[in-house]
């Protein structure tokens, strides 16, 4: 088995759809607004959830943040970049009472949270601690800081076909 799973050639970092509030740190909004309906022919793989032209995978197994990152990459996806309020609500609606790693990390040098596509997160992260540099969602209605080394479930995200 490989640690560094190969990613699909079509893999692109999540971009936000439409204008969003600044705290979600959107990176390149679409001028077309939110995609609210499933368009004809768009498909997510088995066991993935469709929302706004994206596919989401919620794992049942648990792993560290780094291993979660590799897992998502191996599926041609990234850890979820939850950069719109709508996306957050959608994910909160489908998560169990469990913690799920997302693609949000704390950069100690600049003392700020960033999504893994480098866009800044200006919102609130609860449970902050000097050793908690990764983030989860799911158990509460907030973004929670967590140890990157503890094993949690994960949410992966990629483009719908």
């Amino acid at each position: 088995p490989q640690i560094f799973n190969k990613s699909n050639d079509g893999f692109t970092t999540t971009r936000s759809y439409g204008t969003v509030s600044q705290i979600f740190g959107s990176s390149s909004p679409s001028p077309n607004g939110f995609i609210t309906t499933r368009s004809y022919g768009t498909v997510c793989p088995k066991d993935w959830e469709f929302y706004q032209a994206r596919c989401f995978f919620l794992s049942t197994s648990e792993s560290s943040w780094n291993e979660s990152r590799d897992f998502c990459k191996g599926k041609g996806s990234t850890l979820a970049i939850v950069n719109t309020p709508e996306k957050l609500k959608f994910l909160q609606d489908i998560t169990d009472a469990e913690k799920y790693f997302i693609g949000l990390i704390y950069h100690r040098e600049e003392k700020r949270w960033r999504w893994i596509n480098n866009s800044v997160f200006n919102g609130n992260v609860t449970n902050q601690n000097q050793n908690f540099n990764c983030a989860t969602i799911g158990l509460t209605k907030t973004f929670d800081a967590a140890s990157c080394d503890i094993s949690y479930r994960r949410i992966c995200e990629k483009n719908a076909k």
Epitope: F4, N66, R114, N117, N118, D149
Partner: antibody
Amino acid sequence: DVKLVESGGGLVKLGGSLKLSCAASGFTFSSYYMSWVRQTPDKRLELVAAINSNGGTTYYPDTVKGRFTISRDNAKNTLYLQMSSLKPEDTALFYCVRDGEFGHYFDYWGQGTTLTVSS
Amino acid sequence: SIVMTQTPKFLLVSAGDRVTITCKASQSVNNDVAWYQQKPGQSPKLLIYYASNRYTGVPDRFTGSGYGTDFTFTISTVQAEDLAVYFCQQDYNSPLTFGAGTKLELK
């Protein structure tokens, strides 16, 4: 203070074997991916082996696959690299490195141990 | 495997110069790029991860940027202690690969 100290390098004949060790201290060894990176005489860097935190998953590039084996003993805070069927092109300075918190970049490097393969 | 083509191989600099090193990936690596500094007789040291994030304790004269295939590493004002070899590295895909290095030398 994070410390990685390699040992076990030396001069080996073509086709020979050697085992490198890396003693880690100053951090929770069992929580981190660890890797071996080598630097060839022309100063190029190459990842030669990686292992996840519990030792259950390993990775090797094609250049060393089947010849090198990475392992770890979390109780002893030690990383190993068993090398066999050595070739002259394996001659390099071998670094024990710790993977970063957010990916497979390397935030701590040992001082290195030298392997020389003679033909 | 992904090839990281680093340019230039050598750079002649004077103290106070602004220096730019580029790394071009043979395919998109998103922002999964790190930069390292290796001084003579020393091990490499991590400077930048995720293309633009300075590692803890790294002076702010060192910056990184880029996304996809083209990445830039800049030293805004070179100091004598910056004379070293600089390497880029991608961890987007296996095998993990490094650039060949750029050596900064005094004019």
